[in-house]
Amino acid sequence: IPVIEPSVPELVVKPGATVTLRCVGNGSVEWDGPPSPHWTLYSDGSSSILSTNNATFQNTGTYRCTEPGDPLGGSAAIHLYVKDPARPWNVLAQEVVVFEDQDALLPCLLTDPVLEAGVSLVRVRGRPLMRHTNYSFSPWHGFTIHRAKFIQSQDYQCSALMGGRKVMSISIRLKVQKVIPGPPALTLVPAELVRIRGEAAQIVCSASSVDVNFDVFLQHNNTKLAIPQQSDFHNNRYQKVLTLNLDQVDFQHAGNYSCVASNVQGKHSTSMFFRVVESAYLNLSSEQNLIQEVTVGEGLNLKVMVEAYPGLQGFNWTYLGPFSDHQPEPKLANATTKDTYRHTFTLSLPRLKPSEAGRYSFLARNPGGWRALTFELTLRYPPEVSVIWTFINGSGTLLCAASGYPQPNVTWLQCSGHTDRCDEAQVLQVWDDPYPEVLSQEPFHKVTVQSLLTVETLEHNQTYECRAHNSVGSGSWAFIPISAGAHTHPPDEFLFTP
């Protein structure tokens, strides 16, 4: 750490003195102090000498010596007071600029430490400080206004009591700037605009900032529009508003509109698109397939997207059958607005019952007319199976009926022993029926198929099983021949109640 000679923290001299401050370090040293006249600086090896042969009040200040080569960055300082009875203050700067909530140092340095007890800070022309001004004083540095506020941007003077009278410093202008977090905040309304040719339209571009110094403009397809600006100040923010009013829109008014605001921190812009149309429109669409298949007992949400201008005058969901004349409950219909011209309508169908399969139509109306979008809902069912023994054309035949959706596939199994269900170890024979006969196949209903297995002789210690399966599940029926007659066993787990 460098050493200053004389080795005292502060020195008080009278004007006219020759003052010599010597700084000695291990390597080269540098002086740093307030900008003041008449100092001469010369180096002598590892020492640096700061000298003035005619000290004035302006030489009052803290002189710091540093050793640039010192990795610890050590420094030494000495404070010089040049005690001038006519000049109790040395003002180092007449303008101080800080941001809000920073400490503002008003650098009026006392030239005589004895005067410290009688110092005060005032506004120019002897006006008192604003209420809640929290400040402190250091004879080495001056007055510090703590956590300065924008409203404290004033002209100040430092006052010292000398021989019973107050002696003022020259004035110091404090500029407290609002902390500008970034470019001005922007709003452009509406975010999207549609008008029929000949209608009126309004586009409002507004920008706000804590600081008044910012610009805002509205441009149409890269052409800046000349619009009168309205200015306001509320909620501690400056606001500038540009309003574009169009009495009768035409196609040339359509296009991209950008609201642009800029300040020292940068630029913000936001855009919207204005469509001009010949007439009203109403478009319905869905991201879903209009043909829906859902397993019975499960739920389904039907969604319709509506694009319309002007707005909808009416809309509803309708069940078109075929099972009943029931209509969807209004509480299950939900509407959400994505933006001004686009809406989503949802119909919730929880725990679907067989009678709820069929056509669902969404209808909407605006001045452009009616539009409808229809969904077809088919329910999926796991197969139901039944087997009977009969004679067809004199031949003994096992007849298996399977009902479900989608259409079930049928497989016959013959296995040893009497069992409710054949397992792999017992299977003697397997027949697949690739083309069972379709007995009924109506829209929104189950498909019923029939499969025949001709059996010359029923083996009494064996079981015949008809299995049906589809994408939803499977069903089976076991047929056990007994001497007294055939005996059939539906599987224990088959509990479906149509």
């Epitope: 001299v13 009278k14 004007p15 020759t18 003052v19 010599t20 401050l21 005690k83 009875p85």
Partner: antibody, heavy 126, light 110 residues
């Protein structure tokens, strides 16, 4: 015994130079500020210059500023006054005087002169 | 013409009280300390009073100093023949940035 002894006085022509010395003894010279005071024949006292203990602070009377230089060598317990561009009005007895060590004053400046030398005569004449 | 004004002479009889005045201005006496020196004939000056009214050790309490506004005075009570000397006041002058002496007062003990 505390003592200050001046030397180096003499006759010199106007425009000439002279170097006065003051040898200090009997006290710790390096801790005291020192002064030169002169007295023209039959006249009153006139303060000439002041130097602080470390030589950091120096004052001169307006009448000698730019012509006289005060200095000291604490290792040699000596005070000096280099006088250049001498004028007739510089003719006087030159005293070196020690500043009073502890006073109520906080400013580094000439204070009370508590010890004086016997003086050395400087005559400037053609 | 000295910056500090002293009467050129003063006199008194032994045992008397004598006062020597020193008049200045706000830039010297008015705002700085006053010092008084005694110079016996043929000798170097001697410090009598410092900081307006303080006596160094060895100076008899017959000598006292005071200051009021821009004037100072040295009072010598119980005057003695050995007090016959020249007396000088001194003060720093802020306008001149230097130490100034009065012209001196020659005190005669009758």
């Amino acid at each position: 015994e505390v003592q200050l002894v001046e030397s180096g006085g003499g006759l010199v022509q106007p425009g000439g130079s002279l170097r006065l010395s003051c040898a200090a003894s009997g006290f710790t010279f390096s801790t005291y500020s020192m002064n030169w005071v002169r007295q023209a024949p039959g006249k009153g006292l006139e303060w000439v210059s002041y130097i602080s203990s470390s030589s950091a602070i120096i004052y001169y009377a307006d009448s000698v500023k730019g012509r006289f230089t005060i200095s000291r060598d604490n290792a040699k317990n000596s005070l000096y006054l280099q006088m250049n561009s001498l004028r007739d009005e510089d003719t006087a007895v030159y005293y070196c005087a020690r500043d009073l060590p502890i006073t109520m004053i906080v400013v580094v400046m000439p204070d009370a002169f508590d010890i004086w030398g016997q003086g050395t005569m400087v005559t400037v004449s053609s | 013409q000295s910056v500090l004004t002293q009467p050129p002479s003063a006199s008194g009889t032994p045992g008397q009280r004598v006062t020597i005045s020193c008049s200045g201005s706000s830039s010297n006496i008015g705002s700085n300390y006053v010092y008084w020196y005694q110079q016996l004939p043929g000798t170097a000056p001697k410090l009598l009073i410092y900081s307006n009214n303080q006596r160094p050790s060895g100076v008899p309490d017959r000598f006292s100093g005071s200051k009021s506004g821009t004037s100072a005075s040295l009072a010598i009570s119980g005057l003695r023949s050995e007090d016959e000397a020249d007396y000088y006041c001194a003060a720093w002058d802020d306008s001149l940035s230097g130490l100034v002496f009065g012209g001196g007062t020659k005190l005669t003990v009758l």
